[in-house]
């Protein structure tokens, strides 16, 4: 018979014959022959192959490097890779999340507009007139200046975007 030029799904062409691919979780040890089936072996511990394949080596599971702010979200199997995610307080540097960085803090004079998530960084905004922030924080919003009037006090020192107003007693008119 004429040797095949194409093979069925889950097969591959080698030495003019169609051999079965190895199933996910297994690697190729030897190609099939006229007399023998394809020989496959399961991937070892911490290895995987996620497709029907003719690979002679399994892939290593991804390492979720804590130095890059990563932790294991889902442990890998012989058929799936490990899935990493960011540690608490860190966010991904891209959609693929190959590494993470610590959330940025908002400097004094800026407040948190939006708290960071695992995929997005802190969003800061400048404190408008009447508000201040005197700390570097990933959580604190701009605080309103203290209202001296409601405390029966007067402003002794004006506030800025980084400092609160300083209140003091009203000057008593002397008789």
């Amino acid at each position: 018979p004429e040797p095949p030029t194409a093979c069925r799904e889950k097969q591959y062409l080698i030495n003019s014959q169609c051999c079965s691919l190895c199933q996910p979780g297994q690697k190729l040890v030897s190609d099939c022959t006229e007399f023998t089936e394809t020989e496959c072996l399961p991937c070892g511990e911490s290895e995987f192959l996620d497709t029907w394949n003719r690979e002679t080596h399994c892939h290593q599971h991804k390492y979720c490097d804590p130095n890059l702010g990563l932790r294991v979200q889902q442990k890998g199997t012989s058929e799936t890779d490990t899935i990493c995610t960011c540690e608490e307080g860190w966010h991904c540097t891209s959609e693929a999340c190959e590494s993470c960085v610590l959330h940025r803090s908002c400097s004094p004079g800026f407040g948190v507009k939006q708290i960071a998530t695992g995929v997005s960084d802190t969003i800061c905004e400048p404190c408008p007139v009447g508000f201040f922030s005197n700390v570097s924080s990933a959580f604190e919003k701009c605080h309103p200046w203290t209202s001296c009037e409601t405390k029966d006090l007067v402003v002794q020192q004006a506030g800025t975007n980084k400092t609160d107003v300083v209140c003091g007693p009203q000057d008593r008119l002397r008789a």
Epitope: D50, L102, D121
Partner: antibody, heavy 113, light 108 residues
Framework: VKESEGGLFKPKDTLTLTCTVS????????VSWVRQAPGNGLEWIGG???????YYASWAKSRATITRDTNLKTVTLEMTSLTAADTATYFC??????????WGPGTLVTVSS | AFELTQTPASVEAAMGGTVTIKCQAS??????LAWYQQKPGQPPKLLIV???NLASGVSSRFKGSGSGTEFTLSISDLECADGATYYC??????????FGGGTEVVVK
């Protein structure tokens, strides 16, 4: 990771380099391209993430295209409108927007008329 | 555009001494900074990730510090083999992935 052979190109030519990976899946790790002109520093060109998203340095956006073939385990860099300033050693490295712990040996690309 | 400025461009130090290299980002990159060592004819070697964490197999003589916009790499007890060019790299986001200009370290 290993880059294909570079070589001599003429100004205005298009450069195509291929990075072939082994031991890891392109569905698990991204690949980036970095170049280094003779006697100069490292310059990030761009990369492709494990999710297939491509990213480029601002200077390379209009000239570079990075693609991948997960079955062939290759990542390709195509750069158009070459000039003498593109003469450099081109490296591919494992990783998208991340750090690069695994690098190819590099391949020299010379642009000259 | 985002920039990483590395200083000095070159530094000479005696064997057994210490060198300090600075890297300044034009905007905050949190701790998204790495350091590399490169020797002539070789690809770069990763030394530090996350601004201060040693990469696998790297000597503890290398020390990274800083966050935000100011970063430092210190190499103590200098050895002949430390003679190389050192680069910082930001990986905070795709728009701020860039290498510093490099610092050549010459060990006398």
């Amino acid at each position: 990771v290993k880059e294909s052979e570079g070589g001599l190109f003429k100004p205005k030519d298009t450069l195509t380099l291929t990075c072939t990976v082994s031991g890891f899946s392109l569905s698990s790790y991204g690949v980036s391209w970095v170049r280094q002109a003779p006697g100069n520093g490292l310059e990030w060109i761009g990369g492709i993430g494990s999710d297939g998203s491509a990213y480029y340095a601002s200077w390379a956006k209009s000239r570079a295209t990075i693609t991948r073939d997960t079955n062939l385990k290759t990542v390709t860099l195509e750069m158009t409108s070459l000039t003498a300033a593109d003469t450099a050693t081109y490296f591919c490295a494992r990783g998208g927007i991340t750090v690069y712990a695994m690098w190819g040996p590099g391949t020299l690309v010379t642009v000259s008329s | 555009a985002f920039e990483l400025t590395q200083t000095p461009a070159s530094v000479e130090a005696a064997m057994g001494g210490t060198v300090t290299i600075k890297c300044q980002a034009s905007q905050s990159i949190s701790n998204g900074l790495a350091w590399y060592q490169q020797k002539p004819g070789q690809p770069p070697k990763l030394l530090i990730v996350g601004a201060s964490n040693l990469a696998s197999g790297v000597s503890s003589r290398f020390k990274g510090s800083g966050s935000g916009t100011e970063f430092t790499l210190s190499i103590s007890d200098l050895e002949c083999a430390d003679g190389a060019t050192y680069y910082c790299q930001s990986y905070f986001s795709s728009s701020s992935t860039v290498f510093g200009g490099g610092t050549e370290v010459v060990v006398k």
